[in-house]
């Protein structure tokens, strides 16, 4: 007794095609590209039915159902738009990811994804992972370089990368991306094994204000070349935050220097240091202060720190100096770890050129200069830490 002639489901075909199917004959169903075999709601790898002696097939006919990639994943700091039609997530449907304007920019691809036959949303480059909305760095309300100790009060949005670090002593740092803080090794050395002890605050101008964005540290990475109590060479550290912060006009990361950045950091070029450190009155500043200071010739700075009480070789090639020969403008205790920033006139973005590290016992002293960790020397170290963790 032959079995009923198998009618292929829509978007599928039967193989082999025979005039009739008798006992032990079989057929398979193959779906067109973009369709998958489903038995009920369950996907099948393959389908073969065998004709039984009672003249029936041993399995019910499956469906060839259009591949459904499902609702696309949410994009952190971004959004998704259905291009093909509202909520359409099936084969060949198109969606468009975009990032929140102003403060984020899309990395990896152009954000256009298509539902492919394998059931994955796939970019035009073939990527199945989400694009990345990366914070825009170096945006500031302060647009001029030119004309804290001997400094002036910062205004909202001037230094949105500024981070206040509490835990032991008062120190500073600069936001990188949306979950890292760049600072000085000596500022966080005591907390390197107790990262959670660091109280990290951002988005505020007033040191004592209750209105700030709180962040907590997940891990502290101190440069392996830094030796506590033996000078300040390699005085650089990274703090990984346990959560990403939301970027806005008051919280924005600083850019890392491009390869070409040294052209904006020559002798007499103006950098800007900011912080809540000691002012001329000898107290920690209540309001965030900043000072515009010129870069000092490296040999001149080295010579200034060659005489006692400073040991020979205090100033290394991993440092840069800034300040006025006449004194009066400087970073000071409590500013440690903060960024010395420069305006990249080509990109119109601010970047971190130095990290407040050390200086003379008396801040702003004539003939002495503030010494900063030279960030451009540590770009590979920074990039390795951030990519590995």
């Amino acid at each position: 007794q032959p079995c009923p002639y198998p009618m292929a489901p829509p978007n599928g075909h039967v193989s082999p095609v025979q005039a009739k199917y008798i006992l032990k004959d079989s057929f398979s169903i193959f779906c067109e590209t973009g369709y998958e075999l489903l038995q009920g709601h369950l996907p099948l790898k393959s389908f073969t039915a065998v004709c039984q002696k009672d003249g029936s097939w041993d399995r019910p006919m499956p469906a060839c159902s259009i591949v459904d990639c499902g609702p696309p994943d949410d994009l952190p700091s971004g959004r998704v738009e259905y291009i093909t039609g509202p909520g359409v997530t099936t084969y060949k449907a198109v969606i468009q990811y975009s990032c929140e304007e102003t403060f984020y920019t899309m990395k990896v691809n152009d954000g256009k994804y298509v539902c492919e036959a394998d059931g994955f949303w796939t970019s035009s480059k073939g990527e199945k992972s989400l694009p990345v909305c990366e914070p825009v760095c170096g945006l500031s309300a302060k647009t001029t370089g030119g004309r804290i100790y001997g400094g002036q009060k910062a205004k909202p949005g001037d230094f949105p990368w500024q981070v206040l670090i509490l835990g032991g002593t008062t120190a500073a740092g600069a936001l990188l991306y949306d979950n890292w803080v760049l600072t000085a090794a000596h500022a966080v050395y005591e907390q390197k094994h107790d990262a959670s002890a660091l109280d990290i605050r951002m988005g505020t101008l007033k040191r004592l204000s209750p209105h700030y964005t709180q962040a907590w540290s997940e891990a502290v990475f101190i440069h392996e070349g830094y030796t506590h109590d033996a000078g300040f060479d390699n005085d650089i550290a990274l703090i990984k935050l346990n959560n990403k912060v939301v970027i806005n006009s008051n919280i924005t990361p600083i850019c890392l220097p491009r390869k070409e950045a040294e052209s904006f950091m020559r002798t007499d070029d103006i950098g800007t240091a900011s912080g809540w450190g000691l002012t001329q009155r000898g107290f920690l500043a209540r309001n965030l202060m900043y000072v515009d200071i010129p870069i000092v010739d490296h040999q001149k700075c080295t010579a200034a720190y060659e005489k006692p009480p400073y040991p020979r070789g205090s100033v290394t090639a991993n440092m840069l100096c800034a300040g006025l020969e006449s004194g009066g403008k400087d970073a000071c205790r409590g500013d440690s770890g903060g960024a010395l920033v420069f305006l990249d006139s080509e990109t119109e973005r601010w970047f971190v050129g130095g990290i407040v590290s050390w200086g003379s016992m008396n801040c702003g002293e004539a003939g002495q200069y503030g010494v900063y960790t030279k960030v451009i020397n540590y770009i590979p170290w920074i990039e390795n830490i951030i990519s590995d963790f």
Epitope: L38, Q39, H41, L42, K45, D68, G70, P71, T89
Partner: antibody, heavy 118, light 107 residues
């Protein structure tokens, strides 16, 4: 993102009926893309699938439990429910609800512990 | 009734590759799924339809399935991968789970 939350009594007497509800938030239970499933895990043991339901009411049950299980759906409340009758101590387990998308369970609820004891 | 068998436990050193197997009659003819469950937590899907990885699951997780055996492979195993792993398949529209494998990451 869709989240699931199980609720119901943590203690049921032997021979009575265990009743649990799963509330879906962040998405519609009426989506044509999904079934919704129940899975349980006795203390210190492995996972056991109980059954799955579509928003229209279509169900699949584990044959070993089929005679005692009823899964229903309430689209107006964005909930689906499990009833397991004639329970014994062997039904003591953490009961999970999960979204069943073409056979894969993702995501899962946090689970609720149900103890069968007099 | 259909059964899926897994080794109850296995251990691996950090950075090494862990291969967790799941065997069942003609398992390669149907799709296998893998779930990770950490103590006190709900299971999380790590592989579906033999070798597909949901978004958010690290690339070190991969899967294969042929013959009578499905395999979950974790390359460059990390301490955070220590968990119970369950395979699952659908046979005749019935969901079946393996007994689970406890993966211990040494050190």
């Amino acid at each position: 993102q869709v989240q699931l939350q199980e609720s119901g009594p943590g203690l049921v007497k032997p021979s009575e009926t265990l009743s649990l509800t799963c509330t879906v938030s962040g998405g519609s239970i009426s989506s044509s893309s999904y079934y919704w499933g129940w899975i349980r895990q006795p203390p210190g043991k492995g996972l056991e699938w109980i059954g799955s339901i579509y928003y229209s009411g279509s169900t699949y049950y584990n044959p070993s439990l089929k005679s005692r299980v009823t899964i229903s759906v309430d689209t107006s409340k964005n909930q689906f429910s499990l009833k397991l009758s004639s329970v014994t101590a062997a039904d003591t387990a953490v009961y999970y609800c999960a979204r069943d998308r073409r056979g894969r369970f993702d995501p899962w609820g946090q689970g609720t512990m149900v103890t069968v004891s007099s | 009734s259909y059964e899926l068998m897994q080794p109850p436990s296995m251990s691996v050193s950090p950075g090494q590759t862990a291969s967790i197997t799941c065997s069942g009659d003609k398992l390669g003819d149907i799709y296998a799924y893998w779930y990770q469950q950490k103590p006190g937590q709900s299971p999380v899907l790590v592989i579906y339809q033999d070798n597909k990885r949901p978004s958010g699951i690290p690339e070190r997780f991969s899967g294969s399935n042929s013959g009578n055996t499905a395999t979950l492979t974790i390359s460059g195993t990390q301490a955070m991968d220590e968990a119970d792993y369950y395979c699952q398949a659908w046979e005749s529209s019935t969901g079946v789970f393996g007994g689970g494998t406890k993966l211990t990451v040494l050190g």
